[in-house]
Every structure is written in C-alpha cells, then in structure tokens.
Interface confidence: medium
C-alpha cells in the first residue's frame, strides 16, 4: 500500500485557501489609479459609484456626477470634457476583442444638470472621445469617424469608406488591435484639438477565419473575422489627418509612408503628437528587423503634412525583431524636435537614449545589464522611467528621476527605499506635468497606492492599502514565495516557487511548473498574488515552480533572440533544465511532476510534455497554440520569419505539437479550449487532438463552448479550474 | 528603382500648347506629391508647379499661373503638364521631380520645349 | 519669396582640393527645408543632401552639409574628378520653392 497522499498544514489554527475562495475572488486586492484632468486635480470612481472630484492643493473634494445619474442609464464608466461642461456616460458595455467593445454613449451637461438632448449619439458606437481641449467629441460608429463641434450639434461625417470586416477607420482591425497597437482606437487629437490623426485599415484582401457560435438558437451562428495567419495578405494601412476646424473646406489629408518602408510589405506602429502641427509616426517593415521613426510638419501653405527624409530616423536589430514585445515610443522634449526612447544599446541591453539629430548620433542616458522598460514622462527637467536595476532583479519595477535640467544628468531611485520589503514591483501615473503623481505598488506584498510630490517625491497620503484584504487574509496560512536564480552551464534562469505553508526540505513533495515562456513575456515577478496555485500550494501541498528561460524579456538581447527564427526549442530545454535542478534540490518527488500552461504556455507545456524526457507525469495545454501557421502573422512573423520554402518553413513545420503526437504516449495529457477563441482558434486543439487520434495515443480533453481565449465566464472558469484541479489531484494521488 | 521618363516636349510657336507627361514607376506613386521644374538653357533651375498625391491640391509659380494646368492619373501613374499660352520664355528642359516641398528626390531625364516662331 | 544666393559663381579647383560652397537665404529657413543637388551638363539635377546635413542615399561621405538659419554651406572634402558640376541649394519652407542661382565647380 503507498501512504497516504493527503497534504495536512499543521499545529495551526489558520486555514488554508480554498479552490472557491479563487473562485470567488475572495481575496482580490484593489489599486487606485487617479483620473487626472489638471496639474493638481483629479477624478475618482468611489466604491458606491460616485464620481468624485480631489483638489491636491486645496484638499477639496466633491461628487460632481452622482450615482444616481450613473444609475439613471446604467453608467459603468464616465468621461469629462477638458472644459469641464460636460462627461460621457458608457453604458451597455459589449465586449468584442481583448481591448474593443461597443457601448452607448450620453452627454450629461454638468452646467445645467440634465442629459444633453438632440442629434443624440447613435448606438452602439465603436470609439468615443474628447478632444484635448474644449468639448468637441469624435467617435467611431459603423468602422466610419464622426465629428461634433458640440454635444448638442449635428455630427460631421469624416470617412465615408467604412464598412464591416473589410475597411476600419479610426479603429483597428483584429491583428493590429491584439497585435500592434494594444487599444480599441486608431484616432489621436493633436494637443490643441485642430488636427486629428487616424488610421484606416482596409482588409478586404485578408483571408477569413470563421467558427461557430451556438448561441440557444435552432443554428449557430457563423462568426467571420479577416484575420491574417502566418504569411497570408495583410491589412494595407494609411494614415490621414483632417482639420477638425474646417473638416468640409479639405478632406482628410494622406501622411506619406517613408520609402525605405513603402517598398515592401509594411505595418504601421504608433502615432505621437509632438506640438499642435507636428506629429511622429512609426512604421515598421513586415520583416519586423526595421522600424522606421518618422518626423511630420504641417505645411500651412501647402495644406499638406510632409516627412522630411532627414527626419526619419532608423532602428534596426541585426540579431532578432526591433523592440521588445511592441517597438518603443518616443517621449519628446519640450524642444517638439528632440526625444528620448527606449532601444538596445551596443552590449543588446534595452536603455534610454536622447535622440537630438540622428540615431547614430544618440546620447545613451542609462546603461548597465539591465533594462530600462518605460519612460513615464519627460518634463523641462526630469525624466521619469521604470527599470529592473535594483539590486540585479530582473523582475522588480522601480521608478527612477533623471534630472535632465542638471548637467551631468543626475539619477535618483523614488522608490527603492519607500516599503523595501512590501514594494518591489510599481508603476506610476503622473498629472499632466509631474506636478503629483501616484504611485502603485503590485507587491510582494499587499498592493498599496500612494500620491507624492512631483517635486520633492514625498509622500502626500495613501490612496489605497488593502485594508480589508490583509484582515481576510490574517486566518489564512499563505505559501512561503522564493525568488531565486539557477545556473546551468553559461546560462542564468530566474525562478519563482511557491512552498506549501510549514514546508519541510527533509520532505517530497509533487511539483507543478507553470509556463508562459512567449517571446518578451516575464513570468518571474515579484507581484502579490492569491491565484490557482496559490491554493494548490497552500490547500494540496504541491510546490510550484515558474521558470524564465530563454525567449523571455528584461534580460538583454542576447537571452531575449535566442529564440529569434525557432520558436518552441530554448524555451521548453530551459523549463526541462529547470526540472532537473529541482530534482536535484531533494524535495521534490520525482514520480509526481506536472507541467501547465495557457496559450503560448499550453504551446510550451505541451511540447515538454512530448520532450520524451519522462520528467513529466501529467499535463495540461490550455488554448495552446499548436503551429506557428495557425497563429496571427504579426505575432508570428516577428519571431519566426516567414512560412516560406526560401525563409523559414522547415522550422514552422518542425515545430508543431502535432509532429510530436507520438510521445505523448507515457504522459497524461489533459487538452482544453475555448470553442469561440478569436485569439488561439479552436482549430490548434483540433489538430493536436487530430493527431493524437492518429497516433492512437490516449488522452482527455475538454471544450468550452462559445468561450473565448480567456474562458471567462464565470460558469465557465470555475468548471475550467475545478476540472484541472481534480485532474492533478488524481495525477499526484491526492485525494478529494 | 524609381524612375521617371517625360514626354512630350518639341517645337511649339508662340500662344501655342503642348501637353507633357511623366509616366512613373518604382514607388507607390499614389501616395507621393510631384513637381514639374524647369532649366532655360544655360540657366539656373527653376520650380513650376506641384500636385498632392491625390491630386486635390495644386501649386503654380506665379510666372505660369492661369495658363499652365498640373494633372495626374493614378492609375496610369502618370503626371501631365498642360502648358497653354506659350511663350519664348516658356523654353526650357522640363524636369518631372518626385517631391514637392523640402527636397526633389527623383528626377526625369527631361524633355525640351521650344517656343518659337 | 526667399532668395537664396549662392558664392561663388565659380570655383577654380583640382582634383585632391577642398570646396566649399556658401548659400544665403534672404530669410531664415528650417534646416528640414534646405537640399542641395549636383548637376553635369546634359543630365538631370542629383539629390545630394537634404535636411541641410544629411547625405541622400548613395552619396559618398566627402560632402557633407551644414548651416542654419539663412546661412549654410555645402563641403567637398576631397573633389574628384567626377564632382566637377553646377550645384544648387534649395529651399522649401515657403511656396514657391526655390533654388540658388548655382555655383560651378571647375577643374582648375
């Protein structure tokens, strides 16, 4: 007989977490982000839905939109116009993507306390927003931009082109929305509210993807998205500004593409306004090696906006992809000429560097092996940014002023010191200039969110500390969180593990590796969390492990392009070498390892698991991506090159899970997806489960119908979790 | 390659017209502003007009204005001059330069015209 | 419209020298706005820098380009026996664009 499986916490009057209190979010903490709309004033939501207005300086506070106005049209997020006269109401929120939704919008008029009635907005609109000053709004409505001077008047139609999946203006389309911009608008105000920039989109070459949706109907429904994979014909995008003061004098005017890019197939990136005529626009060829910075003047005499050749500035990565995940942006001094952006430095590490004429004459502002991952704000004479610096943790985020009024430059670290042990994890939200910002902290510890002086960096109060949380969680017995790096051969792994609650190194113990391990994706971080394997660790007594290998971000370039043009080799060696460590560690049982992911994580977990090591016991692939063909070419084509005889087809195809069906033979596998995913297609599950069926290899699955890439639905997620759980329990012989 | 070739040029008498063309490849030319710019012989260089990439906005040198008219077609890639009225002082080489505003990048060949009688 | 004016007319040089080429705005111009091409006789003017200092594609690294202002120059470094031509600057800040009168490089 072998002895009993079951994991007791002892002498502890506490209680280990549940897998319902994870479903029922019982211990989830809050941050503040302060909504700033001055140098010193700011919006906030209250907990009862009130929307209150703060004075830093004065200390006043007032509701100036009440929940009983909110409630009146079903409110759950509000927007003011920059002359204070009026706010947006959203109501009948309907997600579509990861960031796009539709909504109906209402014009509440805080002068004289009513909705603002006549030429009402149409529903359900697409994109809505203020222009930077004043109350003029632009919104998106049927793929097609439209423009009110007032709420009151009557609407100027902008684009005329739009039309459902086949021409996007001002909003991006699926591929550009997930992969390039991260947001549900392609439209920018210029700072003065004249000029607005948009995108068009047309993707009427795009080849369709189309799944069920089963809905209650008699018939399902057939959802159709032009959704470029790998090496298929991609959105052909321009960039237009119109003047919105005159918008029926002159059309919208073109933004020429710089030619070094125009040659070839190429994407837009992103679009900065630097002064009220004068905007940068970023572009990036479909080989995404070259990104091209591209400076443009309004020509008031031309009515034209021009690119100067000396004016585009070129990066270029010889060892993988431009960028980190996204190229980064630049953050233009006051000058409107110069800037300062994130790139890689020679040794490949990503660090700040001032660009006044040319890249190649850039001035390198920070330096080290270590990164620099997000300029905040630049000011007359300060700069604010975020690294991985402090005391060599690649996942920490602290925040750090550069005094660029100084000379030489001088560096301070605002938050180093602040809560040492609680805080190692922040970032920041400024007011317009720096005046005040908040600041919020992620963890290790609870989540705290603080206000300061943009001068002197002193605290000013506590937003947000997670009172509540930390009471709740006194009577809970917490796994034990390490932070920890691991050698092998030439080569350094960061890793997470979470140790049951009175865990004992003389005892074993059944190991779960969670893996993302995508390309520019961090795992190891240093951020509070009560999540699945929190409980696994502290109800089940199983030990969790998350390993950054190679592929993964904020390490330099050298970690980061190991896996430039062959996805799906580094990443799962390094999670297999991190195994063996662990087993050398001696607390680990070594006939009780199991190996999870979700997404690029199922892609990993499921490729170790046919690494025909016999590491593994069990798995599961949630939504894995199963060939690189299947997935978005953007996404796809950074990493991987082309799917082509004469580029990269051979590793396309030898990377597939599929290729690997047969030794999945001595494992458990367990394969879940969502039947409605517009991310990962149902389509890569069922060519895994295709191919098992093939190789008539046993294994489980699970569907989840008309779920998405997240199987968020609450009935959805806590069957999601409560099935992976009992899998595992039975995969450890833990009993129920 | 980007290329221009113009055409059209000749032996014109005074007050009479001539057309030129342009016919451009080796660049989006939808998306690009073109000029026409002139030589006298032996002279120095001198702009004449200029049309947006669309071709709903044109410029004039006051010296042709009222009487020469700047045109495109897209889908032929092609640029045309139209010059009416002619002169003696309208003989040149007639250049077709890709750009309009900070720099000509591209330049045609050319093409004589010769007013004279 | 601004004038641009170019010294010398003429400049008498051999081959291994260096030139020097001067070009006045009769008002400020941006540096964005200012180019300068290079003509032989019988062909068609060369884009040689624009941005007032940034070479244009294929152009050797012995010219080079400075100024601002109203006041910008155009350097050969070492001319070589293919640099002998007529160059011009440009600007394009204003409608209409216009062009220096040229300065003729010849072989001394």
């Known amino acids: 007989l072998r002895p009993s499986r079951v994991y007791k916490p002892e002498g502890n009057t506490k209680r280990a977490l549940t897998l319902k209190d994870i479903l029922n979010g019982t211990f989830s903490y809050k941050t503040y982000f302060p909504n700033w709309i001055s140098e010193q004033e700011y919006l906030h939501q209250s907990e009862d839905d009130n929307i209150v207005f703060y004075n830093i300086e004065t200390r006043e506070s007032y509701i100036i939109l009440s929940n009983s106005t909110m409630k009146s049209v079903n409110a759950t997020d509000y927007g003011l116009s920059p002359d204070r006269q009026f706010v947006y109401l959203e109501s009948d929120y309907s997600k579509l993507w990861r960031y796009s939704y539709t909504a109906t919008y209402y014009i509440y008029d805080l002068q004289n306390g009513e909705f603002v009635r006549g030429y009402e907005l149409p529903r359900p609109i697409q994109y809505l927003c203020w222009s930077p000053v004043g109350s003029k709004l632009a919104y998106v409505y049927q793929n097609n931009i439209y423009l009110k001077q007032r709420p009151g008047d009557p609407p100027f139609q902008i684009t005329y082109t739009g039309r459902e999946n086949r021409i996007f203006n001002g909003i991006p389309d699926w591929v550009y929305e997930e992969e390039m911009l991260a947001t549900k608008y392609a439209l920018w105000w210029s700072p003065d509210g004249k000029f607005l920039a948009y995108v068009e989109f047309n993707d009427s070459d795009i080849p369709i993807i189309a799944y069920s949706y089963y809905g209650d109907g008699q018939y399902p429904r057939t959802i159709n998205i032009p959704y470029p994979k790998a090496g298929a014909k991609n959105p052909v995008v321009r960039v237009f500004i119109v003047d919105t003061t005159y918008p029926h004098h002159v059309g919208p005017m073109e933004v020429p593409v710089p030619e070094m890019i125009a040659s070839s197939d190429y994407y837009f990136s992103w679009l900065t306004w630097v002064s009220s005529e004068r905007v940068c626009l970023q572009w990036l060829k479909r080989v995404q090696n070259v990104s091209v910075l591209s400076i443009c003047d309004f020509r008031e005499d031309w009515h034209a906006w021009e690119c100067p050749k000396n004016q585009e500035h070129v990066e270029e990565s010889r060892t993988g992809w431009a960028g980190g995940f996204f190229v980064s942006t630049p953050a233009f001094s006051q000058d409107a000429t110069s800037y300062y952006k994130i790139f890689s430095d020679k040794d490949g590490y990503k660090h700040i560097h001032y660009i006044k004429d040319t890249v190649e004459n850039a001035i390198q502002i920070t330096s080290g092996k270590w990164e620099a991952i997000y300029i905040f704000r630049v000011t007359q004479d300060s700069l604010f940014y975020s690294s991985n610096e402090f005391e060599g943790y690649p996942g920490r985020r602290n925040i750090y002023r550069i005094s660029i009024g100084n000379s030489p430059p001088s560096k301070k670290c605002v938050t180093c010191h602040l809560r040492k042990e609680r805080c190692q994890y922040y970032t920041a939200s400024f007011s317009y200039k720096a005046k005040y910002y908040a600041l919020v902290c992620y963890g290790p510890g609870l989540p705290i969110s603080t206000l300061h002086d943009g001068r002197t960096d002193q605290e000013i109060q506590v937003l947000e500390e997670n009172k509540e949380l930390e009471n709740s969680l006194r009577n809970i017995q917490l796994p034990k969180v390490e932070i920890k790096k691991l050698k092998d051969g030439g080569l350094t792994f960061w890793y997470k593990m979470i140790l049951p609650p009175q865990f004992d190194r003389s005892k074993k113990y059944p190991l779960l590796i969670q893996v993302y391990g995508g390309p520019c994706s961090q795992s190891v971080k240093s951020v509070f969390a009560v999540n699945w394997i929190t409980y696994l660790a502290s109800k089940e007594g199983i030990v969790i492990a998350l390993v950054d290998g190679r592929g993964t971000a904020f390490q330099g370039d050298k970690f980061l392009h190991a896996v430039y043009r062959k996805l799906g080799v580094y990443e799962v060696e390094d999670q297999l070498t991190a195994v063996r460590k662990f087993i050398e560690m001696g607390f680990i049982d070594e006939e009780r390892i199991a190996i999870w992911g979700w997404s690029y994580g199922g892609y990993v977990s499921s490729l170790a698991l046919a690494s025909g090591t016999g590491l593994f016991k069990c798995g599961i692939a949630v939504a894995p991506v199963s060939s690189w063909e299947y997935y978005a070419s953007i996404y796809s084509e950074r990493f991987m090159g082309l799917p082509t005889k004469d580029d990269n087809l051979e590793h396309y195809k030898n990377s597939t899970v599929m290729a690997r069906a047969e030794y999945f033979r001595n494992v458990d596998y367990l394969l879940i997806h969502g039947t409605a995913d517009d991310n990962v297609h149902f389509q890569n599950s069922a060519q895994i489960a295709k191919a098992l069926v093939n190789a008539q290899v046993d294994f489980q699955a699970m569907w989840y119908s008309d779920q998405n890439h997240g199987i968020s639905s609450g009935r959805s997620q806590n069957h999601l979790y409560t099935h992976m759980t009992h899998f595992l329990k039975q995969c450890f012989s833990l009993s129920d | 390659e980007v290329q221009l070739l113009e055409s059209g040029g000749g032996l014109v008498q005074p007050g009479g017209s001539l057309r030129l063309s342009c016919a451009a490849s080796g660049f989006t030319f939808s998306s690009y502003a073109m000029s026409w710019v002139r030589q006298a012989p032996g002279k120095g260089l001198e702009w004449v007009s200029a049309?947006?990439?669309?071709?709903?906005?044109?410029y004039y040198a006051d010296s042709v204005k009222g009487r020469f008219t700047i045109s495109r077609d897209n889908s032929k890639n092609t640029l045309y001059l139209q010059m009416n009225s002619l002169r003696a002082e309208d003989t040149a080489v007639y250049y077709c330069?890709?750009?309009?505003?900070?720099?000509?990048?591209?330049w045609g060949q050319g093409t004589l015209v010769t007013v004279s009688s | 419209e601004i004038v641009l004016t170019q010294s010398p007319g003429t400049l008498s040089l051999s081959p291994g020298e260096r030139a020097t080429l001067s070009c006045r705005a009769s008002q400020s111009v941006s540096r964005s706005y200012l180019a300068w091409y290079q003509q032989k006789p019988g062909q068609a003017p060369r884009l040689l820098i624009i941005g007032a200092s940034t070479r244009a594609t294929g152009i050797p690294d012995r010219f080079s380009g400075s100024g601002s202002g109203t006041d910008f120059t155009l350097t050969i470094s070492r001319l070589e026996p293919e640099d002998f031509a007529v160059y011009y600057c440009?600007?394009?800040?204003?409608?209409?664009?216009?062009f220096g009168q040229g300065t003729k490089v010849e072989i001394k």
């Open positions: 049309i947006s990439g669309s071709g709903g906005s044109t």
């Open positions: 440009q600007q394009g800040q204003v409608i209409p664009p216009t």
């Open positions: 330069a890709k750009g309009w505003l900070g720099n000509f990048d591209y």
